[in-house]
């Protein structure tokens, strides 16, 4: 039903969002998560994993920087709100962003190899 | 904050399960009354693939698994006894159990920890 | 067996270089960050590096910064520093250490350490 | 950065005493603390980490508590072996940083 998330999935607040333990690069987190109909982690706010704030691991989430608009952006084309991370105008641009439930946030190479998270909206 | 699904407001869903992740420490017995008060029971785990999962989610937790000492076997909540190893068993003191990152350890039952609860749906 | 072989600590004099290397086996070295931490004589420890999984990514203590360069060999399961303009408050044992399962900030296993002695 | 000071910064105990060394964080770290035990000559060994997970192999007297800046390392019934100086570490953010240490001497 509309209200469920798929097996290994995590249902919170009207989202599903599936935690690897496996570690990938940037770029296969986010092919494994289209594959699986949703999309590398978008935060709406830092709160939004606070089920998991005690966790001590770093997540690659769906931001990327976008050299056209000059910003960084999610996945769906919205830009970074500036308050969600303070630190973000010392991130190299040219890296992805780990992300820990707890608010941290570091700028890594793409190519480095990290645990992700994907996020289906229910509804 | 939106709320959808078959948990409680705040409670997330896992494999058919609801769980409350708490971020209070308290005491076994402390923890025990706690989930009762929210009709559910202390965690518990059913197999290797839940206990990574917790384990991802917060590194240690109190679950429903205890003995009276350390002459008599460990036991579930509902009075069953416990298959799996509980690390350090052998000292005496230590008569509760904790989740401790994908590994079952005993604890001394005065500790506070932080508790999770669970309900099944 | 986890087991960390550091190798490459000398006496060097102000300004000199060296490489130190630490060669590593008893587990998949290409998934852990791996770190530097050094300790100077009769003192405590003092984290000096620590490079990401792939090496794709250095953070550095800001006494080594500019100075100092972390790489690693995946293909050896070697673990390199690079230790240029050094400085008399460099001497110290240097230790490498593999970052722990559950969060890489942690130091789980060490190697027995490297002497470095800056000196003229 | 993160300053990290422990007390006392030694102490004279008896085998089988109960002794407690704290930490504590110049801003709040959540849980992301580690400590260690360091013999003389001999690499640092890791005991606890998330602030009171206990590492595999390490002896189930040694216990960690504590979250937020104020942290506790507590050895419940001292062993010969354990007489070496201890090391509180931080991994919330970069630099990582460690306390000064504790050198726990035999009474």
């Known amino acids: 039903d509309c209200c469920s998330c798929q097996e290994k999935w995590v249902g919170y607040r009207c989202n599903c969002y599936f935690i690897s333990s496996e570690q990938k690069t940037w770029n296969e987190s986010r092919h494994l998560c289209a594959s699986q109909k949703s999309s590398l982690l978008q935060l709406q706010n830092t709160d939004e994993l606070d089920f998991m704030s005690s966790s001590q691991q770093f997540y690659w989430i769906g931001l990327s920087y976008s050299e056209e608009h000059t910003a960084w952006l999610w996945e769906n084309g919205s830009a970074l709100s500036q308050y969600l991370f303070p630190s973000f105008e010392t991130f190299n641009t040219k890296n992805c962003i780990a992300y820990n439930p707890n608010g941290n946030a570091l700028d890594e190479s793409c190519e480095d190899k990290n645990r992700y998270i994907c996020k289906q909206q229910l509804i | 904050a939106r709320h959808c699904g078959h948990c409680p407001e705040e409670w997330i869903t896992y494999s058919n399960s609801c769980y409350y992740i708490g971020k209070e420490r308290r005491t076994w017995e402390e923890s025990l009354l706690a989930c009762t008060s929210k009709n559910s029971s202390l965690l518990s785990i059913d197999n290797e693939e839940e206990m990574k999962f917790l384990s991802i989610i917060s590194p240690s937790s109190w679950i429903g698994v205890f003995r009276n000492s350390s002459h008599h076997p460990w036991v579930t909540m509902n009075g069953l006894a416990f298959k799996h190893e509980i690390k350090d068993s052998d000292n005496a003191e230590l008569n509760c159990a904790v989740l401790q990152v994908n590994r079952l350890k005993s604890a001394q039952c005065g500790s506070s920890i932080i508790y999770h609860c669970k309900h099944k749906l | 067996e986890v087991q960390l072989l550091e190798s490459g600590g000398d006496l060097v004099q102000p300004g000199g270089s060296l490489r130190l290397s630490c060669a590593a086996s008893?587990?998949?070295?290409?998934?852990?960050?791996m770190h530097w931490v050094r300790q100077a004589p009769g003192k405590g420890l003092e984290w000096v590096s620590t490079i990401t999984n792939s090496g794709g990514t250095t953070y550095y203590a800001d006494s080594v910064k500019g100075r100092f360069t972390l790489s690693r060999d995946n293909s050896k399961n070697t673990l390199y520093l690079q230790m240029n303009s050094l400085r008399a408050e460099d001497t110290a044992v240097y230790y490498c250490?593999?970052?722990?399962?559950?969060?890489?900030?942690?130091?789980?296993?060490w190697g027995q350490g490297t002497l470095v002695t800056v000196s003229s | 950065d993160i300053q990290m000071t422990q007390t006392p910064s030694s102490v004279s105990a008896s085998v089988g005493d109960r002794v407690t060394i704290t930490c504590r964080a110049s801003q709040g770290i959540s849980s992301w603390l580690a400590w260690y035990q360091q013999k003389p000559g001999k690499a640092p060994k890791l005991l606890i980490y998330a602030a009171s997970s206990l590492q595999s192999g390490v002896p189930s007297r040694f216990s960690g508590s504590g979250s937020g800046t104020d942290f506790t390392l507590t050895i419940s019934s001292l062993q010969p072996e354990d007489f070496a100086t201890y090391y509180c570490q931080q991994a919330n953010s970069f630099p990582y940083t460690f306390g000064q240490g504790t050198k726990l001497e035999i009474k």
């Open positions: 250490a593999k970052a722990h399962y559950y969060a890489r900030g942690y130091f789980d296993f």
């Open positions: 008893g587990f998949t070295f290409d998934n852990y960050a």
